[in-house]
Interface confidence: medium
């Protein structure tokens, strides 16, 4: 009846993991396509959207024939997080306007909290060093306009959907490397 | 909305060059990897290469190594495509398209290069 | 010859379901995303479907798409006239260090 009190776990399948990993991922790249589509329904802006306090893009063509496991995770994970945060700042501070995007911003807020979960489980299982805890980030300033919060909220999920999409065909080629 | 437009292609001489250029707009151009695709007369699509969003990292099919280079300036939203020891069956539609990851996920409409004596 | 193998045409009647294949080894289809693109008449590629079964803004959920080990199919349901274009599958070849296409497959509407 099962392993006794103390006895290793097995661990499960590297492969498997980081399926379900992929799977996560394309479900919450697929998520932040469908909010993009009423993002700039409800509030069309053309051109460039920036914003500088976002992570500058960490893969492409280039860099993915040199990945390494470890270094993925790591910068995944932490530019991940760093769209959480963002992600939660602009559920603080949108104004009115931008409370028509709710609940579907919160949901996306959960589902990226649970890929960083998953991601840091896979690091683990993985036996990749864990990252000691990120220093408090400075808080990022409120939007100065309904419009600059607008601009953020596209640049925002416009970065996120770029990352997931590179991190959807990161995480397929490393699956083939292990 | 994204747009690419690409420019320059025309009739060309075997074993003259060309410059294409792709005028990108609608979307952060130097967040992107860009891509060069063909299609010559009746026939399939084949990929010809691609420059990274920095332009730091290029790849290229076998088929134009040595011949063709593509570079960008980012400071304009463009990309280009400069085609040296051209020859006939480098006749086709060149395209330029944006790549969000493995995919091509806006095309521009074509310009034509015809190598022809 | 292309690396990724389709049938160079396929046809059906409005309202029927079509499915086009798309044959690939370990190197392509078995260790990347597959991606399909249509092609209307004198126009240029669009997206039509992106790491192997996802839609793009904008493409109707007619169209959907499947991988199994190393090959891959684009089906298309509730078949319509405007629907009559050339489809491409393609994916990045790891042996290549490219992106490889399929030929392509013709399809007619019929009637």
């Known amino acids: 009846p099962g392993p006794p009190p103390g006895s290793p776990r097995a661990s499960p399948d590297p492969r498997a993991e980081l399926d379900s990993t992929v799977l996560l991922t394309r479900s919450l790249l697929e998520d932040t396509r469908q909010l993009t589509i009423q993002l700039k329904d409800k509030f069309p802006a053309d051109g460039d959207h920036n914003l500088d306090s976002l992570p500058t893009l960490a893969m492409s063509a280039g860099a993915l024939g040199a990945l390494q496991l470890p270094s993925v995770l790591t910068r995944l994970r932490a530019d991940l997080l760093s769209y959480l945060r963002h992600v939660q700042w602009l559920r603080r501070a949108m104004g009115s306007s931008l409370k028509t995007l709710e609940p579907e911003l919160g949901t996306l807020q959960t589902r990226l909290d649970r890929l960083l979960r998953r991601l840091q489980l896979l690091m683990s299982r993985l036996a990749l060093p864990q990252l000691p805890p990120d220093p408090p980030a400075p808080p990022l300033a409120p939007p100065s306009s309904t419009w600059g919060g607008i601009r953020a909220a596209h640049a925002i999920l416009g970065g996120l959907h770029l990352t997931l999409d590179w991190a959807v065909r990161g995480l397929l080629l490393l699956k083939t490397r292990l | 909305e994204v747009q690419l437009l690409e420019s320059g292609g025309g009739l060309v001489q075997p074993g003259g060059s060309l410059r294409l250029s792709c005028a990108a707009s609608?979307?952060?151009?130097?967040?992107?990897?860009m891509n060069w695709l063909r299609q010559a007369p009746g026939k399939g699509l084949e990929w010809v290469g691609v420059i990274s969003y920095d332009g730091s990292n290029k790849f290229y099919a076998d088929f134009v190594k040595g011949r063709f280079t593509i570079s960008r300036d980012n400071s304009k939203n463009t990309l280009y495509l400069q085609m040296n020891s051209l020859r006939a069956e480098d006749t086709a539609v060149y395209y330029c398209?944006?790549?969000?990851?493995?995919?091509?996920?806006?095309w521009g409409q074509g310009t034509l290069v015809t190598v022809s004596s | 010859q292309s690396v990724l193998t389709q049938p160079p045409s396929a046809s059906g009647t409005p309202g029927q379901r079509v499915t086009i294949s798309c044959s690939g080894s370990s190197s392509n289809i078995g260790n990347n995303a597959v991606n399909w693109y249509q092609q209307l008449p004198g126009t240029a590629p669009k997206l039509l479907i992106y790491?192997?079964?996802l839609l793009p803004s904008g493409v109707p959920d007619r169209f959907s798409g499947s991988k199994s080990g190393t090959s891959a199919s684009l089906a298309i349901s509730g078949l319509r006239s405007e629907d009559e274009a050339d489809y491409y599958c393609s994916a990045w070849d790891d042996s290549l260090n490219g992106v490889v296409f399929g030929g392509g497959t013709k399809l007619t509407v019929l009637g």
């Open positions: 398209a944006r790549t969000p990851g493995s995919h091509f996920d806006y």
């Open positions: 609608g979307f952060t151009f130097s967040h992107y990897d």
């Open positions: 790491y192997d079964d």
